[in-house]
Structure formats: C-alpha cells, structure tokens
Amino acid sequence: LKGQEFAPSHQQVYAPLRADGDKPRAHLTVVRQTPTQHFKNQFPALHWEHELGLAFTKNRMNYTNKFLLIPESGDYFIYSQVTFRGMTSECSEIRQAGRPNKPDSITVVITKVTDSYPEPTQLLMGTKSVCEVGSNWFQPIYLGAMFSLQEGDKLMVNVSDISLVDYTKEDKTFFGAFLL
Amino acid sequence: LKGQEFAPSHQQVYAPLRADGDKPRAHLTVVRQTPTQHFKNQFPALHWEHELGLAFTKNRMNYTNKFLLIPESGDYFIYSQVTFRGMTSECSEIRQAGRPNKPDSITVVITKVTDSYPEPTQLLMGTKSVCEVGSNWFQPIYLGAMFSLQEGDKLMVNVSDISLVDYTKEDKTFFGAFLL
Amino acid sequence: LKGQEFAPSHQQVYAPLRADGDKPRAHLTVVRQTPTQHFKNQFPALHWEHELGLAFTKNRMNYTNKFLLIPESGDYFIYSQVTFRGMTSECSEIRQAGRPNKPDSITVVITKVTDSYPEPTQLLMGTKSVCEVGSNWFQPIYLGAMFSLQEGDKLMVNVSDISLVDYTKEDKTFFGAFLL
C-alpha cells in the first residue's frame, strides 16, 4: 500500500493489519531509587514501577532492570517526564561570592541500547541550566518523539543526578512508549 | 493475535480491527475563564473551547462542563499545555525584604474522575517553582502520556491559579486526548 | 462504523482500514542554520535534517525547504522540541542598571500553511520569558498536540531567534508528525 492511494476494496491487502489493542505499550512511573553503580562519565539510569498504580506493560512490552524491551520492530512514540527538585543551586551561591558563575544543570536523556551496536544511542535529550534565586526549586523536563525501533532494542531514561529526581508521586515522573 | 506473530493472512482475525478515523479524539483550546466555585484544597478546573478554531471533538468524544467524556474503554494518549504569565513573584519580593523565600509555584494536573470511585485520580502533574527576577514572566508547562481509561471516565485539567493562565491564544493553552 | 459498536464480523466494513506501517510519518532533527531572509514581523523558520541519523520521512510524508508536506488528510500528532542557549539575557543587565526590566523571551511556533488560505495558522506556541541570573543559560521548549490537517498542508517550526537555537545535537532540537 505504501506510497499510493488505496485500491478498490476488493483488491485491498489485509495481511499487515492488526488490532490496535494488541500493540506493545507501556507506561512506567517513578519509584524510589536504590543506589546502583554507573560508569563515571555516563548519566545513571532510573528504575521504574511497571505494575502498581497507573503503571502497566502489555502485549509483550516488558520492563526489566531499568530497561523497556522492544518486542517488535516498528515506529514507536516514546515519552518521559522527570521532575527535579533541589535546594538553591551553587550557581547563585557562587554568584554572590563573586566567582565565575557556570550554571548548574539538570538533564534527562532517553537512550536506546542495541545489543549489536557497541554504543548506546541518545534519542532525546532535555537539558536546562538551573540558577534559581529561591532556596527550594522544582521543575519538570518533558520529552516525547517518534522513533523507528527494532525488535530487541532496549530503552532507558538517564538523568544527570538521581538525587534530584522527585520520586514522591507517580504523576510527576514517568516514562512510556507505544507502537504506532 | 496477542503475544504471537501474525498468522498467514487467510487465518487473520479481523473482528477487533477498526478504522482509525473512527476513534474518539479531541483537541480543546483555551477560553477566557469565568469565575467558578471550587473546593478549598482542590485546584480549580479549566473551561475549554471544543469547536471553534483549532478545537474539535469527534467520534463520541464529548466535552461538557470542563470534562472530556471517555466514550470507549482503551488506551488513550492525553496531553495538555498551559501557559502561565504573571508579575514578579512574591518570592523575589520576599527575598529582597530578607524574609524566608519559599518559592511560588505553578502547577498543572490532568485528573481522571470515575463515578464509581470517590476520589479523583491525578494522572499527570507538571509543577514548577517560580522565582523570577524580571517584573513580567511567562512560561508553559506541557504534559502528555498514555493511560488505560474506561468508558465513562472523565478528564479535566486543574491548575494552581486560574488567574495566571494565559487565555489569549488557542495555541498557547490546550488539552487533548485520542484513543490509540 | 462511526458512533456505534462494531457489527458482527461478517458485516464488518473493511474499506477504511489501513496498515499502520503505511501511514505518513516524519521525525526531523536539527541542522546548523544557514542565514535566510524572513519577513520583519515574522519569526524565522528552521531548516531540518530529514534522512541522516535519527531523522526519517516515510509513506509520502516529504520534507522540502523548511516544510513538512502533508500527503493525506487526517488527524496528525505534531510535536517539536527546540533547545535554546545564550549568554546572560539583557533582562538581568538592564535590571542591574536600574532600567525597566522587560524580560527577554524565547518562543517556538508550529505553523500550518495552506495554499488556499492567505495567512499561516499558528497551531502550537511555547513561549517563555528568559531572565537568567547565570551567565550562560540553556533550556528546551517542547510542544505536541493533535490537529486535523488536509492533504497539501505544510508545517514549519518558527523561532523567535535562530541564533539562540542549539543545533549541536539531534536529540536536543527536533520536529515530527505522524498520521493517527
């Protein structure tokens, strides 16, 4: 059917059609993070809740060990929001002291890992300088886009600093994907 | 079909398939808000435009009295952006006066109401401290994710302060949902 | 099928069904911008990468000359993220000098152009005041929503200041659309 108008219905090719309710889908929500090792120059990956509350995985989309496993090749919409919170960033303290004020930052990366490829691929990045005047700050970073994924690909969410992630509510920090 | 590769086309099960153009969908846009009562500890819900300009509802997805009504059970992608604007937040004034500087904040919540359950469920929350140096500030909060909804569920968008919502343009503040 | 439950499968109407993998889709990523003319009171449009790296167009969704061309009428989900970065905004400099402090701002607009209609239509806008204390700042603006588009419509992304767009990484600044 690609690249042309639909033929008359008696010529219609039905084979690739599939029930929408049968497509791989997942919505994962934040959990308290347990300290884990991560490589020095690599942002740590978040753990997720996959079944409690609003979280679910279905139709062979499985979550295991920080990764969403892609069960079927196709185009997926992938999204995540991470809410960060912290005390006054060093930036403003440094500024008051008259030293050069390189701002702190918060970053979220949605990363794809393909076993046949040595390096992870960064699919989406949201990064923001944080140089707040107030003593306590909080803010979300939202990401979402469509990508062509292969069966066996793995998705994870990495953040610049796990200790700044707000894990208190499942509606504040989440990660999901669905086959289009 | 769930959990297995597609059988040859002559064995294909067609019953659950449905035309994509037939799925419930809505994109609502901001309107000027009329003052309405809301419970003391609950964020007020926004009114929306459902048919003028870019706004639409279709295929039994109806909008009524601040709510989007879910006409069919399934997995929906739900999204909203609210653009806030205000004068200098009290935070910076308080700070200048040497008082403790708890930051002001802006919050958007997409909430699900189920008649059979007494409490609304918060599906998505975007919350941000506002402690701006400039005298006039403005910024959007965007949310979007997938949820399993039941026929009869109702969706609304709540905000921390209706008076800060930018209602001037339909492209700045909006709310939508569609069945996947 | 609209507005009613599915009839028994032997009565099923198949004509409007179509393979999901056959739907128009595109994910475009940032490239370095070449200076181009734009009308004085109109935000400049971004150029995009359409085939290298994570970028793709498929199923008659084509990219040409800053525009995504819509090949088929229907409801599309459209999204974009633009990451901005800059030096200290004038806002804080003006403030220090005691002059009135109208904040600078950053804005992203997803615009629809219809040949039969003289004026472009702004579908989505994300706009944010920038009044940073730090000397270097960076932050994303994300947008996404569903719109009913017509065959022949063209989509573009406009920004308030091209020189502030971070074009260094394909995961930071992107633009996409897919038929639902």
């Epitope: 959990v31 308290r32 753990h47 409690l52 295991t64 894990y167 509510k169 | 409490e119 | -």
Partner: antibody, heavy 123, light 107 residues
C-alpha cells in the same frame, strides 16, 4: 527501624469473618515507596500471597484470585495500620497469617514481616 | 501467574559444607527474585533481594545469583544457625508467588 505488630483472634468459626490488624511503626501506610501485604502459610499451600493495599495517586488494592470474592484489605491512615478481613471462612483457611511491607524501589521485597498469627477455623 | 519451583525440597548437610538451593520460574523476569530464611515458629526474614543483593546484617556467606528464569542461593560454609527453611519469591508480577521451600537439616 520498621516494625509490624499483628493483632486479632486466633480462633474463628466456619462461615464467619476472619479479622486481623497490622500496626506499623517506623513507616507510613501512605508511603509511595511501599505496599502493605497479607500472606498466609499452611502445610498444604506453603506461603500464599493474599493481597495488598497501597497508595500512589489513589488507594489501590490487589487480591489473589483464590480469595478475591471474600477478602478486603483496608488502610487506616489515622492509626497507621492496615487490616485483613476474610469472609465465609472454612477449615481450609486455617493457617499462620503474616502481614508484610513490600519495599518498592525498582527491585522490591518483603521486609519486615509481622510476627504471625495462627488462625484456626473450627467450630 | 508465575510459578516458582524450588529444589531440593529438603537437604541434609554438615557445618562447614557449601550448599546450593535452586529456584526456577515459569517465565523470565530478570532479577526480581528474593530469598528468605524461616526458622520454626518465626516469620520469614529477608536474606537476598534483587537476585544477588545481600540484605543489611546478613552474613556474607550467603550469596545469590541468576537472572531470567534460573536462580541460585548459595551458603559458602554452613553455620549451626543456618539450619532452617529457605524460600524464593518473585516480585515481578502480581500475584506474588513463592517457592515451596527447602528445609535444610543437619546431617
């Protein structure tokens, strides 16, 4: 440290309702990082998970299919405890009943457990 | 539902022995596997969580390994206080499920 203290009768008549309570100290029944569970142990069935209550965006309950029609688990935020009610009991419900916190932090596990209550169903 | 099959159901060993207990799941779930020790008249106590992480206060002679469907609990050198029953448990999906237990007895 977190402790769970169980209370409730050890003898219940057939067709009546088994009721147990689990008092929590050192944590909150409303914690978003825990679920609050009832588990029973008998020689015939081994360790059998019965159900749980927990709060995320709202209070949620999940129950084992084997007891779903008869079980209720309720949180009591004012007393920081949770309870088990099992209706229409039969002698097959005779077991040691435990309450347990499941820590939810990516991985999840039961810790701590209550001291256990031997419930005998007999007339 | 995920079924957990533990083996052996009972085991006789001596102080100082190295002992291995295995647990097999009916479907794969990576590392969502916990091990508990239970002494007579007492509640189970957590030994190992997430397949291989040692619970605070548990002696280092206990270790866990495995991923997917096959998991192992090893006691490197049995001590008198280790004679008890041991249970595996999956925490990946609801309902939670346990192995039927391994009773470790003195030879």
């Amino acid at each position: 440290q977190v402790q769970l203290q169980q209370s409730g009768p050890g003898l219940v008549k057939p067709s009546q309702t088994l009721s147990l309570t689990c008092a929590i100290s050192g944590d909150s029944v409303s914690s978003s990082s825990a679920t609050w569970n009832w588990i029973r142990q008998s020689p015939s069935r081994g360790l059998e998970w019965l159900g749980r209550t927990y709060q995320r965006s709202k209070w949620n309950n999940d129950y084992a299919v084997s007891v779903k029609s008869r079980i209720t688990i309720n949180p009591d935020t004012s007393r920081n405890q949770f309870s088990l009610q099992l209706n229409s009991v039969t002698p097959e419900d005779t077991a040691v009943y435990y309450c347990a916190r499941e820590v939810v932090a990516g991985p999840r596990w039961f810790d701590p457990w209550g001291q256990g209550t031997l419930v005998t169903v007999s007339s | 539902d995920i079924q957990m099959t533990q083996s052996p159901s009972s085991l006789s060993a001596s102080v100082g022995d190295r002992v291995t207990i295995t647990c097999r799941a009916s479907q794969s779930f990576s590392s969502y596997l916990n091990w508990y020790q239970q002494k007579p008249g007492k509640a189970p106590e957590l030994l190992i969580y997430a397949a291989s992480s040692l619970q605070s206060g548990v002696p280092s002679r206990f270790s866990g390994s495995g991923s997917g469907t096959d998991f192992t609990l090893t006691i490197s050198s049995l001590q008198p206080e280790d004679f008890a029953s041991y249970f595996c448990q999956q925490s990946y999906s609801t309902p939670r499920s346990f192995g039927q237990g391994t009773k470790l007895e003195i030879k």
